[in-house]
């Protein structure tokens, strides 16, 4: 099954993807949309890239604001509302024969909780990752993107979950 | 007004080649990933190959694997289908046909068709 | 690969009357699935997409329905163009497959 984010209305959304250019600096293509990956491309398209740069986007809530030339091609949602709900895909297009790495994930877009006891660690937990997370084929991204909390494992995600509990915070 | 001319069909002997060529106009050729599609003489549509649109990434149909290669010219808005060591069964009118624009793998736009026959 | 059976294979029917075709998928497919209408000598053209999305210049008497492995394309009221082939394609899982088509006839 697909990783599950979730973000809250008005917040920005992160959706983790990347590949690694090899050698370095050897980019190559990637398509975000929004549909579980079809057979090749991607159905709705969000975002492009070339082997250079961002070359389509439909829309400007939509960005890469990782280290794109590393390879960091994750996805930022900004200012999310319900309709953003649903499978992404990120689909790396490396070159030759059916070669493409094929990444889906859930972003699932909440209301924003009415009690929140500590709201800026709550805040950054919401922006920067999910708050419940299944396992999936493609882990977290190792680069952090501006204004954001570094990417946590699962034990740490469990571990600040059980910290959070403890404090009172709610974690759904 | 998007046009997509299919061209290079003909007669060939089994074992033979042919390349088609898919000469389009009236969009932005490189963003779209491109497909063929052959229609045999009594029988339904069958996919047979698709490109992305950077042309790095190529599909093919396990019939037609190792046989046929797919290529572009974004330069020229072309899109190409070399077939090698053709066979009876792959008798067929070519389309050619572009993906959607916002990515799927349907197609928005055919070309008419270039008939290909192997026969000896 | 996934196999796409529809039906009926011809269907008889005259102008003004109201056509249901069935496409059903051998696995689903989710909602990637579209439909295309072909005319003797002619390249076919994309009538539905996404299940249900009519494609730019379609009629609105041409609807699409359905997910997972079942789904029917209506023309809500038969004019004497829709006289066609019909065909159902799948894109949700590699290799893209067509249906086998549905011929609307004049009765």
């Known amino acids: 099954s697909e990783v599950e984010y979730i973000a809250e209305v008005g917040q920005n959304a992160y959706l983790p993807c990347s590949y690694t250019p090899a050698p370095p600096g050897n980019l190559v293509p990637v398509c975000w949309g929004k549909g579980a990956c079809p057979v090749f491309d991607c159905s709705n398209v969000v975002l492009r890239t070339d082997n250079r740069d961002v070359n389509d986007r439909t829309s400007g809530r939509y960005w890469l604001k990782g280290d794109f030339h590393k390879g960091d091609v994750s996805l930022t949602i900004e200012n999310v509302t319900l309709a953003d709900s649903g499978v992404y895909c990120c689909r790396i297009q490396i070159p030759g024969i059916m070669n493409d790495e094929k990444h889906n994930v859930k972003l699932v877009v909440i209301k924003p909780a009415k009690v929140t006891p500590a709201p800026t660690l709550q805040r950054d937990l919401t922006s920067a990752f999910p708050r419940m997370l299944t396992t999936g084929e493609h882990g977290p991204a190792e680069t952090q993107t501006p204004g954001s909390l570094p990417d946590v494992n699962l034990t740490q995600i469990f571990t600040l979950t059980n910290e959070l509990r403890d404090s009172g915070a709610t974690i759904r | 007004e998007v046009q997509l001319v299919e061209s290079g069909g003909g007669l060939v002997q089994p074992g033979g080649s042919l390349r088609l060529s898919c000469a389009a106009s009236?969009?932005?050729?490189?963003?779209?990933?491109w497909s063929w599609v052959r229609r045999a003489p009594g029988k339904g549509l069958e996919w047979v190959s698709a490109?992305?649109?950077?042309?790095?990434?190529?599909y093919y149909a396990d019939s037609v694997k190792g046989r046929f290669t797919i290529s572009r010219d974004n330069s020229k808005n072309t899109l190409y289908l070399q077939m090698n060591s053709l066979r009876a069964e792959d008798t067929a009118v070519y389309y050619c046909?572009?993906?959607?624009?916002?990515?799927?793998?349907?197609?928005?736009?055919w070309g008419q068709g270039t008939l290909v026959t192997v026969s000896s | 690969e996934i196999v796409l059976t529809q039906s009926p294979a011809t269907l008889s029917l005259s102008p003004g009357e109201r056509a249901t075709l069935s496409c059903r998928a051998s696995?689903?497919?989710?909602?990637?699935l579209a439909w295309y209408q072909q005319k003797p000598g002619q390249a076919p053209r994309l009538l539905i997409y996404?299940?249900?999305n009519r494609a730019t210049g379609i009629p609105a008497s041409f609807s699409g329905s359905g997910s997972g492995t079942d789904f029917t394309l209506t023309i809500s009221r038969l004019e004497p163009e829709d006289f066609a082939v019909y065909y159902c394609q799948q894109y949700g899982s590699s290799p893209l497959t067509f249906g086998g088509g549905t011929k609307v006839e004049i009765k």
């Open positions: 490109i992305s649109g950077s042309g790095g990434s190529t």
């Open positions: 696995q689903s497919v989710s909602s990637y």
């Open positions: 009236g969009f932005t050729f490189r963003q779209n990933a």
């Open positions: 046909a572009k993906g959607g624009d916002y990515g799927g793998n349907y197609f928005d736009y």
């Open positions: 996404d299940a249900s």
